[in-house]
């Protein structure tokens, strides 16, 4: 499977909520014997690789943002610890991942990676990720509301495969 | 601070079962996160895996030593065990028991292993 | 299966020399690949994740890079302290190991 990101540059005014999004693609399994592990970290534009550092968001490491769920589940933190940082991540049936950033600031801008796991039971394991930006302004220049630019369906950058 | 200690007979004779143990510390077996896992490292030689087990009792074994292994897991106990088939000489190396964080990939933890001789 | 060639298999540098092993992976591993040292009679150490973060506590002196099938492990001035064996391992798939470099001092 892979992971794409539809948008790889949010542009946001500060105070804004934003919901930074990844989606599974491909033959993604459903079934009982698959786990999923998924979760969300900052980072910066490597020379050679995009997500390798990982950075908290929020002071909140990726441990902190992870969910886990069956192929055929849906899952969302619950924690109150994500959400006194104004955080959430959910996952969908479809194949969606995302987290939600409240209130946004300045400090928030900067590049963000969202990491999947796929657990088959007895046969093997596979992780991708995705990266994208996010540019939070403020003054006259700032947009009203977010700004989503869509991925271009050559930028690698964005989609990785397992 | 998280402690693995291997635990099992050092001489077992060949075509015999190789039973070890891992007794966890400092941490739940039962965390969601991890893997528990087994390692060999022939008298030597390199490290090669040999399976692990997820914390709901899943497995993942190795292909060359599926046929042969087994991992169980005593939550109640937090300790999980290898348990390996028909040993030969091949067989004889220093067994480590190691965790694994799904999201990070490597073997974080380790015991400090343990000889297995496999001799008659 | 993936394959994880490392090379050399042992090497011999004076202290305070720059020391490089690679690691290459039968395919693409993305950048999913860490490094552990080695002393005798001890567990592996980890000392490096996803292809270039350094482990807490792990001397800046050790660094690694790459990406995809092509990786590599420095130390940027060896000490008496890293006579060790060093092992790539992936972790793209089910675990598979390089088979070690062994590093001494001249």
């Known amino acids: 499977f892979k992971v794409a990101t539809p948008y790889s540059l949010y542009v946001c005014p500060e105070g804004q909520n934003v919901t930074l999004t990844c989606r599974l693609l491909g033959p993604v399994d459903k079934g009982h014997d698959v786990t999923f592990y998924k979760t969300w970290y900052r980072s910066s534009r490597g020379e050679v690789q995009t997500c390798s550092e990982r950075r908290p968001i929020r002071n909140l490491t990726f441990q902190d943002l992870h969910l886990h769920h069956g192929g055929h589940q849906a899952a969302n933190t619950s924690h109150d610890l994500a959400q006194r940082h104004g955080l959430e991540s959910a996952s969908d049936h479809h194949g969606n991942f995302s987290i939600t950033m409240r209130n946004l600031t300045l400090l928030d801008s900067g590049l963000y990676c969202c990491l999947v796991v796929e657990i088959r039971h007895h046969h093997s394991e596979h992780r991708v990720h995705g990266a994208m930006e996010l540019q939070v302004q403020t003054g006259k220049d700032a947009p009203s509301n977010c700004v989503v630019y869509p991925s271009s369906s050559q930028d690698s950058e964005n989609i990785t495969a397992a | 601070q998280l402690q693995l200690q291997e635990s099992g007979p050092g001489l077992v004779k060949p075509s015999e079962t190789l039973s070890l143990t891992c007794i966890v510390s400092?941490?739940?077996?039962?965390?969601?996160?991890?893997?528990w896992g087994w390692i060999r490292q022939p008298p030597g030689k390199g490290l090669e895996w040999i399976g692990s087990?997820?914390?709901?009792?899943?497995?993942h074994y190795n292909p060359s030593l599926k046929s042969r292994v087994t991992i169980p897991v005593d939550t109640s106990k937090n300790q999980f065990s290898l348990k390996l088939s028909s040993v030969t000489a091949a067989d004889s190396a220093v067994y480590y028991c190691?965790?694994?964080?799904?999201?990070?990939?490597?073997?974080?933890?380790w015991g400090q292993g343990t000889l297995v001789t496999v001799s008659s | 299966d993936i394959q994880m060639t490392q090379s050399p298999s042992s090497l011999s540098a004076s202290v305070g020399d720059r020391v490089t092993i690679t690691c290459q992976a039968s395919?693409?591993?993305?950048?999913?690949l860490t490094w552990y040292q080695q002393k005798p009679g001890n567990a592996p150490k980890l000392l490096i994740y996803?292809?270039?973060n350094l482990e807490t506590g792990v001397p800046s002196r050790f660094s690694g890079s790459g990406s995809g099938t092509d990786f590599t492990f420095t130390i940027n001035s060896l000490q008496p302290e890293d006579v060790a064996t060093y092992f790539c391992?992936?972790?793209?798939?089910?675990?598979?190991f390089g088979g070690g470099t062994k590093v001494e001092i001249k």
């Open positions: 087990i997820f914390y709901s009792g899943n497995t």
């Open positions: 391992q992936q972790y793209d798939n089910l675990p598979t």
């Open positions: 395919q693409d591993i993305t950048n999913y």
């Open positions: 190691a965790r694994r964080d799904i999201l990070t990939g490597p073997f974080d933890y």
């Open positions: 400092g941490g739940s077996i039962s965390s969601s996160g991890y893997y």
């Open positions: 996803d292809a270039s």
